[in-house]
């Protein structure tokens, strides 16, 4: 049975503006034309869906308008960006890839990217 391996970086540090980007790469066992990518956050054994997008190979990734994620795709590689992160959002972000069409369906799950978010220090009041 052909496996679908998903690779993602082990650790990413969010920017001071609360933006984190990482690449999710999958080794496709078939010639998929429709792919679904889901970002899951695992913290304290709780798993929540951060965002999800389905895209046609060769087309752009489209997340819902109110999503905190954006992304681009290139071949079997998806560049994901998560915005609006705060220190409390630090956790393991797992990339889940599903080959939706044509059959057969394949599921691949990455080991997760630990995203560290440090809230910026508030600017001290300036004395003029």
């Amino acid at each position: 049975c052909k496996a679908m391996h998903v690779a993602q970086p082990a650790v990413v540090l969010a920017s001071s503006r609360g933006i984190a980007s990482f690449v999710c790469e999958y080794a496709s066992p078939g010639k998929a034309t429709e792919v679904r990518v889901t970002v899951l956050r695992q913290a304290d054994s709780q798993v929540t869906e951060v965002c999800a997008a389905t895209y046609m190979m060769g087309n752009e990734l489209t997340f819902l308008d109110d999503s905190i994620c954006t992304g681009t795709s290139s071949g079997n590689q998806v560049n994901l960006t998560i915005q609006g992160l705060r220190a409390m959002d630090t956790g393991l972000y797992i990339c889940k890839v599903e080959l939706m069409y044509p059959p057969p369906y394949y599921l691949g799950i990455g080991n997760g990217t630990q995203i560290y978010v440090i809230d910026p220090e508030p600017c001290p009041d300036s004395d003029f």
């Epitope: 049975c1 052909k2 496996a3 679908m4 391996h5 429709e34 679904r36 899951l40 798993v47 869906e49 999800a52 389905t54 889940k96 599903e98 939706m100 069409y101 059959p103 057969p104 369906y105 394949y106 599921l107 691949g108 799950i109």
Partner: antibody
């Protein structure tokens, strides 16, 4: 809590049709793949079909492909199985099952019995 | 298409004994996408193990799963009266999803 309640089973003659429904509650229905799994009397479990998320993608077992159609209405949190050209070997309890985040089947309905007999 | 074979078909044991159930796949199961379910008469199946070795929420630690590739095992360390049931393995993660034929654990 997650609940899956099937309905629509009954006795039907070979060659006829039947439509099963599954009312889901306690979770965000559109975020999960939904399956039908059946079990003939005294036999093992057999996967029948799956429908993914928005309903655009569906996959079927060879035994039912071309005769059964899986569908969903995310606005009503309901899963369906339209069964046409029914055969005696389709007699089974049909379970509505949620495909969990990690891919395995995590919640099952109690099932509805379909009996195909003349 | 992967075929799962479970053995033995029936296992006759006494409460307190150890039960070892086997699930063998005709091809390697990718990413250990293998789950175990328990089913009692008139009830829906109940998830015990996923990912070959991870216990589902609320499952007692006397249930454990092991294995990889083509050979998987469900072990019940000490059988309790409520453990006598039929056990199925499931290969997931790729369609078609496949169940094993089941192993019945009954009271000796």
């Amino acid at each position: 809590q997650v609940q899956l309640v099937e309905s629509g089973g009954g006795v039907v003659q070979p060659g006829r049709s039947l439509r099963l429904s599954c009312a889901a509650s306690g979770f965000t229905f559109s975020s999960y793949g939904m399956h039908w799994v059946r079990q003939a009397p005294g036999k093992g479990l057999e996967w029948v079909a799956v429908i993914w998320y928005d309903g655009n993608n569906k996959h079927y077992a060879d035994a039912v492909r071309g005769r059964f159609t899986i569908s969903r209405d995310n606005s009503k949190n309901t899963l369906y199985l339209q069964m046409n050209s029914l055969r005696a070997e389709d007699t089974a309890v049909y379970h509505c099952v949620r495909g969990g985040i990690w891919g395995y089947f995590d919640y099952w309905g109690q099932g509805t019995l379909v009996t195909v007999s003349s | 298409e992967i075929v799962l074979t479970q053995s033995p078909g029936t296992l006759s044991l006494s409460p307190g004994e150890r039960a070892t159930l086997s699930c063998r796949a005709s091809q390697s199961v990718s990413s250990n996408y293998l789950a175990w379910y328990q089913q009692k008469p008139g009830q829906a199946p109940r998830l015990l193990i996923y990912g070959a070795s991870s216990r589902a929420t609320g499952i007692p630690d006397r249930f454990s799963g092991s294995g990889s590739g083509t050979d998987f095992t469900l072990t019940i360390s000490r059988l309790e009266p409520e453990d006598f049931a039929v056990y199925y393995c499931l290969r997931y993660g790729t369609s078609p999803f496949t169940f094993g034929p089941g192993t019945k654990v009954d009271i000796k």
